[in-house]
């Protein structure tokens, strides 16, 4: 199995390899096969990464940062393969690697530019701060700095606060948007141009529902086909907001097809789930069930949030008893 990395061919014997933080990559190098093979990989033409000659590795003078992280494809050397297998790349590994290969006939030089990207799955959160409502798109660890765009009802909006903290390895980014009093739908896109990876968060508010005590309510939650791929692992969580914090009512994991229900009056229709419809029922409503209900469908590539506001009113019987 080859590690996730892709090569971009550019002129002058130089290739660009893009790897992901903490994953393994291959720095490619080939040569015209010959005898008396010497392979010498160097970083920035100064640090020794890997040396091979007289039929075996010689790593006594290898720079310590590469210890136990490099190897060659030994069975392939006689076929002209001098590629370097490189374990657990970090952002500090970025730079130019030069492979010098000597044979009885000639010395060849291959340069490889290694770029490393980070993209931990972002999240979209809905938060209440006093009387204000916020949508927050955030990514805990990303490199290089991503492009974040917001849309309201499919129209790009320029208001784009970005709270950024940088560490040695990567950036942590929050992009909050004040949506107080809005019934629009919102979309946030975070793009890592190096890894060619895009994540989208989408937020939709449904019309408020008015119900009587002891009735049941049905709340819809269906993914938007543009983003949703049932073959990809995802998680669905239903939660209720009470006094500013969400408590989880139930969740579903697509990988195991497991449903976990924390509220006995909550029910999910298994057949609808099989059709990718995650609508839920809450039975026997009481006054304290009034509030906001959030359906969160999340995968590595998207988060879809659907908000329902439920108002539970006293039934006539209850009102007349009081």
């Amino acid at each position: 199995i080859f590690p996730l990395a892709f090569f971009i061919y550019v002129p002058m014997n130089e290739q660009i390899v893009i790897g992901r933080l903490d994953e393994d990559i291959i720095l490619p190098s080939s040569f015209e096969r010959g005898s008396e093979v010497v392979i010498h990989w160097k970083y920035q033409d100064s640090y020794k990464v890997h040396s091979y000659y007289k039929g075996s590795d010689h790593l006594e003078s290898q720079d310590p940062r590469y210890a136990n992280r490099t190897s060659l494809f030994y069975n392939e050397i006689q076929n002209g393969n001098a590629s370097l297998f490189f374990r657990r790349v970090s952002l500090l590994d970025e730079g130019i690697y030069t492979c010098y290969v000597g044979t009885a006939i000639q010395v060849i030089t291959n340069k490889v530019v290694l770029k490393v990207g980070v993209f931990l799955t972002p999240v979209m959160k809905y938060e209440k701060r006093n009387t204000n409502s916020f949508l927050i798109c955030s990514v805990l660890s990303v490199y290089p700095r991503p492009i974040i765009t917001w849309k309201m009802d499919n129209t790009p909006i320029s208001e784009n606060n970005m709270e950024e903290t940088g560490s040695l390895d990567s950036f942590s980014i929050n992009s909050p948007l004040n949506i107080t009093g809005s019934n629009s739908s919102y979309e946030c896109t975070i793009e890592n141009s190096l890894l060619k990876q895009t994540w989208t968060g989408r937020w939709t508010m449904k019309d408020g529902l008015h119900k009587m005590q002891s009735e049941h309510v049905s709340l819809s939650c269906q993914p938007v086909n543009d983003y949703f791929s049932p073959n990809q692992d995802f998680k669905v969580t239903w939660s209720r907001m009470k006094s500013g914090t969400f408590s989880v009512l139930a969740y579903y994991l697509s990988s195991s097809q497991n449903t976990i229900i924390n509220e006995s009056r909550f029910s999910w229709n298994k057949e609808l789930i099989n059709q990718s419809d995650f609508s839920m029922n809450l039975m026997d409503l009481n006054l304290s069930d009034s509030g906001e209900y959030l359906c969160n469908i999340s995968s590595d590539e998207y988060t879809l949030l659907t908000i329902h506001t439920v108002h539970v009113e006293p039934s006539q019987e209850t009102a007349s008893h009081n």
Epitope: E36, V37, V38, H40, K42, D45, K48, S51, Y53, K54, H58, E60, S61, T98, Y100, G102, T103, A104, I105, Q106, V107, T109
Partner: nanobody, 132 residues
Framework: DVQLQESGGGLVQAGGSLRLSCAAS????????IGWFRQAPGKAREGISC????????YYTDSVKDRFTITRDNAKNTVYLQMNNLKPEDAAVYYC?????????????????????????WGQGTQVTVSS
């Protein structure tokens, strides 16, 4: 710790001789070719001679051929450059450098023979002055 230490430089009259030494430590000497380079003020560093370990082959640039002789003593981890019939244009700082055998001082690929990138370790240099 890797070290290459040149010695034997000095002031000599034109037509005279000097013997430069390059003492190596901290790396497997037998696996490395050793090259001699020189740099005169305002000029680029140039490779003038090298000796491979595996084949024991020696190479010289045209300007020093028949006047300079390179030898190595693997028991002492030392390479010598015997310089005879010195000329004023030989005046420069002389450096020794070590590169993996089979890359540096390549026996077939003369274009790569003195490529500085193929030499991993360098000495500090010794001054040679030739008076006319």
């Amino acid at each position: 710790d890797v070290q290459l230490q040149e010695s034997g430089g000095g002031l000599v009259q034109a037509g005279g001789s000097l013997r430069l030494s390059c003492a190596a430590s901290g790396f497997p000497f037998d696996d490395y070719s050793i090259g001699w380079f020189r740099q005169a003020p305002g000029k680029a560093r140039e490779g003038i001679s090298c000796i491979s370990s595996t084949h024991g082959t020696t190479y010289y640039t045209d300007s020093v051929k028949d006047r300079f002789t390179i030898t190595r003593d693997n028991a002492k981890n030392t390479v010598y450059l015997q310089m005879n019939n010195l000329k004023p244009e030989d005046a420069a700082v002389y450096y020794c450098a070590a590169g993996l055998d089979g890359l540096a001082c390549h026996r077939r690929d003369s274009g790569s023979r003195y490529r500085t990138q193929l030499y991993d370790y360098w000495g500090q240099g010794t001054q040679v002055t030739v008076s006319s």
